[in-house]
């Protein structure tokens, strides 16, 4: 798995380089996670025909994956920094159970799946430091998450492959929207 941001050999070799600002660190972290998702998607697409699945079939699912909407204040029109930051953190916290589900779903990219999960936890911590209104952030209920995970793991082989594909696609879209929004902050 690639080395997480801030831990590569270049950082060691160049000690007098300016330390990254909070925003730069967050930006770099998101791009690192997106690279990890690309690698996981590559394995998923090589293994099955899931990536050719129709948008209709993907839309017709029983998952409740976080998605950016106008009211979240993350789009250019109606942009609201505080509302948007709360949405990003809440969304990432909601994605955590799905990232846990992705573990033991990959053969050659097993470490990559773990790296995506761990890097997301770090990203959440970075963003929580940035947020002023932490009270507005709702943390998912662990019991609900546990039963959701059990239900997802009970699915048949095809459904699990589809679920994996959809989680990766949705997480990628969520992170890309987050990255655009955070660059405006």
């Amino acid at each position: 798995a690639p080395v997480p941001p801030g831990e590569d050999s270049k950082d060691v070799a160049a000690p007098h380089r300016q330390p990254l600002t909070s925003s730069e660190r967050i930006d770099k972290q998101i791009r690192y996670i997106l690279d990890g998702i690309s690698a996981l998607r590559k394995e998923t697409c090589n293994k099955s025909n899931m990536c050719e699945s129709s948008k209709e079939a993907l839309a017709e699912n029983n998952l409740n994956l976080p998605k950016m909407a106008e009211k979240d204040g993350c789009f250019q029109s109606g942009f609201n920094e505080e509302t948007c930051l709360v949405k990003i953190i809440t969304g990432l916290l909601e994605f955590e159970v799905y990232l846990e589900y992705l573990q033991n779903r990959f053969e050659s990219s097993e470490e990559q799946a773990r790296a995506v999960q761990m890097s997301t936890k770090v990203l959440i911590q970075f963003l929580q430091k940035k947020a002023k209104n932490l009270d507005a952030i709702t943390t998912p209920d662990p019991t609900t998450n546990a039963s959701l995970l059990t239900k997802l793991q009970a699915q048949n082989q095809w459904l699990q492959d589809m679920t994996t594909h959809l989680i990766l696609r949705s997480f990628k879209e969520f992170l890309q929207s987050s990255l655009r929004a955070l660059r405006q902050m």
Epitope: E60, R105, Q155
Partner: antibody, heavy 121, light 111 residues
Framework: EVKVEESGGGLVQPGGSMKLSCVAS????????MNWVRQSPEKGLEWVAE??????????HYAESVKGRFTISRDDSKSSVYLQMNNLRAEDTGIYYC????????????WGQGTLVTVSA | DIVLTQSPASLAVSLGQRATISCRAS??????????MNWFQQKPGQPPKLLIY???NQGSGVPARFSGSGSGTDFSLNIHPMEEDDTAMYFC?????????FGGGTKLEIK
Amino acid sequence: EVKVEESGGGLVQPGGSMKLSCVASGFTFSNYWMNWVRQSPEKGLEWVAEIRLKSNNYATHYAESVKGRFTISRDDSKSSVYLQMNNLRAEDTGIYYCTRPGYGNYEEAYWGQGTLVTVSA
Amino acid sequence: DIVLTQSPASLAVSLGQRATISCRASESVHNFGISFMNWFQQKPGQPPKLLIYAASNQGSGVPARFSGSGSGTDFSLNIHPMEEDDTAMYFCQQSKEVPYTFGGGTKLEIK
């Protein structure tokens, strides 16, 4: 042509053990989850166990009625799946089928001919 | 667990007529555009034979007179026209999630 064939059934005393084997052909075995299903006049058709892939750490799932007594395993190099049955009870009597489940609406499921397991004193 | 309730328990149909067997699931077996409901035919001394998978897809070598329909929780198997060879037990099965479950069966006979 997809084929699954069971073996290893027979007569066993209550509390005894037995190992069923299933060999598959006609498809890339290592790419598919595999299952055991059983049938008895008393309980009808009943799913018993499932084993997943290497990428899933060979995760297993069992029917409540066999949990802790039965163990499903696989050997991808031999295209085989096994069912180790311990502490057998009279109610475990039945025909045991090895099945390769379907995949979405692309591929259908395949069942073997079955092997009879009789648990009796 | 998803419970499957099959009806009727037995059915007698005249040759050439239509036989309809129903199967109701205790919760939806539908996801990503597919309903994971299968139908099997079983004759004495033989293993179950797959007739229909994913609610409406015909198994290989299955005659066109067998058809499946339904979505979500309510499904049916239709046999038309009924032939002598169709005398058998019929089972529905959900393969959406473990534990995979079966209906109690329907005994189909000729009237």
